[in-house]
């Protein structure tokens, strides 16, 4: 009986010779838990593990802590890979994070962080980021230093309000901060002056709700 080949991320999938975009099964070392993730094998050299995607509003992102922990949605469409998997993965080696954004006028931009990891669940999956480059703003729209993750049933933000309830979606809210890529999806021509939309302030400014977002990770030095 041959040994089962398992992949921890899409970079390993790519290096094994699978260079086609699509959904792959990933497993962490010393674990039997599997997750289904979309692998982008074309953008910037390929090997990207997609950890979040918004594109059409088909999936509800106002979810519980547990749902954000394990992931939800459809890996071929809108989804969240899961904080626990991403936390464990990004603490095993150094990862970069690329955030790709689309507006309703046909423009695209990105933010690239040269080092990204999430703390453990005990530390509320706090986000850690370093080294920003890209076209989606010279200042990080994810507040620095990083905040704890909050959901509608887990208020870990720095606001007198409950940001996740006010803005909808789970995110690394400050009070509430310059971004929320898990906010309410608004269609074209209804996407401005929104208090709870898909926000990336240092690219599109206040109240602008984006058309599409993708968050992807890859080992540094891939």
């Amino acid at each position: 009986k041959g040994e089962q080949i398992s992949f921890r991320d899409c970079a390993e999938v790519f290096k094994s010779g699978h260079t086609t975009n699509g959904v792959y099964t990933l497993t962490l070392p010393n674990s039997t838990e599997e997750v289904k993730a979309y692998c982008d094998m074309e953008a910037g050299g390929g090997g990207w593990t997609i950890i979040q995607r918004r594109e059409d509003g088909s999936v509800d992102f106002q979810r519980t802590w547990k749902e954000y922990k394990v992931g939800f949605g459809n890996p071929s469409g809108e989804y969240w890979l899961g904080n626990e998997f991403v936390s464990q993965l990004t603490n095993q080696q150094r990862y970069v994070l690329k955030i790709h954004l689309k507006d309703w006028e046909g423009n695209e931009a990105y933010s690239l962080y040269e080092h990204f990891y999430l703390s453990s669940e005990e530390l509320n999956y706090r986000i850690h980021l370093k080294g920003l480059t890209g076209t989606a703003g010279k200042i990080s729209s994810i507040s620095q230093p990083g905040n704890d993750f909050s959901t509608k049933d887990a208020d870990n933000d720095k606001c007198i309000c409950k940001c996740s309830q006010m803005l909808t979606g789970g995110w690394w809210f400050d009070a509430c901060g310059p971004s929320n890529l898990n906010g309410m999806y608004y269609p074209q021509r209804q996407n401005t002056n929104k208090f709870n939309g898909i926000k990336w302030y240092y690219w599109k400014g206040s109240g602008y709700s984006l058309k599409g977002t993708t968050m992807m990770i890859r080992p540094a030095g891939f």
Partner: nanobody, 129 residues
Framework: EVQLVESGGGLVQPGGSLRLSCAAS????????IGWFRQAPGKEREGVSA????????YYADSVKGRFTISSDNSKNTVYLQMNSLRPEDTAVYYC??????????????????????WGQGTLVTVSS
């Protein structure tokens, strides 16, 4: 649909006065803070004044303290900025913007610019002789 419409701008001589209005629709002022901002050509947008809690809390930038007064009429869902003793350096496009009043950091009194998610189109104020 959330809308903010500014009016009242115009040309005024130094030392003169203007009253700007910000009419809000799609939400009620009771639960929101309204800020006035201005942007002069080639300069960053800056906060001028803000109001919340039915006028219970107000903020003024140092450059306008004693000259500008912010007020609200919640029955008309409108916020006003009375500007007296105007100076040439007050020349700018003036914008009003809204933020949910509760979106405050622990220990803070006012809001960073990026928290104001709804904006008007602006009204031009020119102070010149």
């Amino acid at each position: 649909e959330v809308q903010l419409v500014e009016s009242g701008g115009g040309l005024v001589q130094p030392g003169g006065s203007l009253r700007l209005s910000c009419a809000a629709s799609g939400f009620t002022l009771d639960d929101y803070a309204i800020g006035w901002f201005r942007q002069a050509p080639g300069k960053e947008r800056e906060g001028v004044s803000a109001i919340r809690d039915n006028g219970g809390s107000t903020y003024y930038a140092d450059s306008v303290k004693g000259r500008f007064t912010i007020s609200s009429d919640n029955s008309k869902n409108t916020v006003y900025l009375q500007m007296n003793s105007l100076r040439p350096e007050d020349t700018a496009v003036y914008y009003c913007a809204a933020v949910p009043a509760g979106r405050l950091r622990f220990g803070e009194q006012w809001y960073p610019l990026y928290e104001y998610d709804a904006w008007g189109q602006g009204t031009l104020v020119t102070v010149s002789s």
